[in-house]
């Protein structure tokens, strides 16, 4: 015997209260597959969340974050405040990186400068709050006549595309 609910298409549910007829999903809900006995709840994008894709009767909404915030967590389940380069987010807000650390993004934590001496190299460009140090050749390579090293261009700010 075929289950009568199997005939219910996506966007509907099999309504046990109405002799298993196919009823449209109620407002703010959806079903992405046929034959469902219940509709899923649409995600709402409110507050710091912004609607990236509207909910339909057959697919869930997708959220990203309003300007000044970035997505965190699965499916952008949270929005975290952006900070400036050279800062990190703490419980008290954005704080400058401590000396000896840097952050070249608007998110994440301050990380220690690279220790060039661990690789037997010298510091070619000093670090800042926004940039890591640039390590040069080892001191032994800095003999007269050695070719000069051009430091790389500063890294571009990564785009914060929605997750």
């Amino acid at each position: 015997l075929q289950d009568p609910c199997s005939n219910c298409p996506a966007g509907t549910f099999c309504d046990n209260n109405r002799n298993q007829i196919c009823s449209p999903c109620p407002p703010n809900s959806f079903s992405s597959a046929g034959g469902q006995r219940t509709c899923d709840i649409c995600r709402q994008c409110k507050g710091v969340f912004r609607t990236r894709k509207e909910c339909s009767s057959t697919s869930n909404a997708e959220c990203d974050c309003t300007p000044g915030f970035h997505c965190l967590g699965a499916g952008c389940s949270m929005c975290e405040q952006d900070c400036k380069q050279g800062q990190e987010l703490t419980k008290k807000g954005c704080k400058d990186c401590c000396f000896g650390t840097f952050n070249d993004q608007k998110r994440g934590i301050c990380r220690p400068w690279t220790n060039c001496s661990l690789d037997g190299k010298s510091v070619l460009v000093n670090g800042t709050k926004e940039r890591d140090v640039v390590c040069g050749p080892s001191p032994a390579d800095l003999s007269p006549g050695a070719s000069s090293v051009t430091p790389p261009a500063p890294a571009r700010e990564p785009g914060h595309s929605p997750q």
């Epitope: 703010n28 992405s32 597959a33 034959g35 469902q36 219940t38 509709c39 899923d40 709840i41 649409c42 995600r43 709402q44 409110k46 507050g47 869930n60 965190l72 967590g73 699965a74 499916g75 389940s77 949270m78």
Partner: antibody, heavy 121, light 112 residues
Framework: SQSLVESGGGLVQPGGSLRLSCAAS?????????ICWVRQAPGKGLEWIAC?????????YYASSAKGRFTISRDNSKNTLYLQMNSLRAEDTAVYYC????????????WGQGTLVTVSS | ALVMTQSPSTLSASVGDRVTINCQAS??????LAWYQQKPGKAPKLLIF???DLASGVPSRFSGSGSGTEFTLTISSLQPDDFATYYC??????????????FGGGTKVEIK
């Protein structure tokens, strides 16, 4: 039709361990759902325990009562969710349900039938 | 941590009565609130989501209202099938170190 079926409950001594399973059918763990464990002690109310995102990232969240002792995980190839429970106490005695959320706000429209865990010597 | 407080804990009513159950959140949860019905030995069943949206297959005699910290579930005309325990639940994912999600203590609706 979509369903969740729990298993793995039973009698365990205090301090012991147990692993509960929640088998999903009718939908894929590659979908963007949260699946959570909720428990109910005999004659008591509902208590949220832990959640995992069964999409790609697998993010996990725990209630304070579960942190450190309970671990939520999943096996996408088996479309199954697990709750590893260690250092069990008498107060962990409850029916354990798995439940699914599509809203990201702890609203569960699909529940399993539950599995009973009894912690007693 | 988020705390949900339900009142009353028990409610005696008759078929045809209008029944109201209240739920209070310890902090502002906007409309991120759901109501469930549970019968003995069964899993909870979703009735209302986002404080006022009716879940699929739920009779229209059930309705929800409220936002922020105060919420209400109303059954306009109690039916024999409605004698059960009702739970509110509020919550949202904040961060892995601080996740909020809580059920109210439940309201048992029994026959007067």
């Amino acid at each position: 039709s979509q369903s969740l079926v729990e298993s793995g409950g039973g009698l365990v001594q205090p301090g012991g361990s147990l692993r509960l399973s929640c088998a999903a059918s009718g939908f894929s763990f590659s979908s963007n759902y949260w699946i959570c464990w909720v428990r109910q002690a005999p004659g008591k109310g509902l208590e949220w325990i832990a959640c995992i995102y069964v999409g790609s990232s697998g993010d996990t969240y725990y209630a304070s009562s579960a942190k450190g002792r309970f671990t939520i995980s999943r096996d996408n190839s088996k479309n199954t969710l697990y709750l590893q429970m260690n250092s069990l106490r008498a107060e962990d005695t409850a029916v354990y349900y798995c439940a699914r959320d599509s809203s990201s706000y702890y609203m569960f429209n699909l529940w399993g039938q539950g599995t009973l865990v009894t912690v007693s010597s | 941590a988020l705390v949900m407080t339900q009142s009353p804990s028990t409610l005696s009513a008759s078929v045809g009565d209008r029944v109201t159950i209240n739920c209070q959140a310890s902090e502002d949860i906007d409309t991120y609130l759901a109501w469930y019905q549970q019968k003995p030995g069964k899993a909870p069943k979703l009735l209302i989501f986002y404080a006022s949206d009716l879940a699929s297959g739920v009779p229209s005699r059930f309705s929800g209202s409220g936002s922020g910290t105060e919420f209400t579930l109303t059954i306009s005309s109690l039916q024999p099938d409605d004698f059960a325990t009702y739970y509110c639940q509020g919550g949202y994912y904040t961060s892995s170190a601080d996740t909020r999600g809580a059920f109210g203590g439940g309201t048992k609706v029994e026959i007067k």
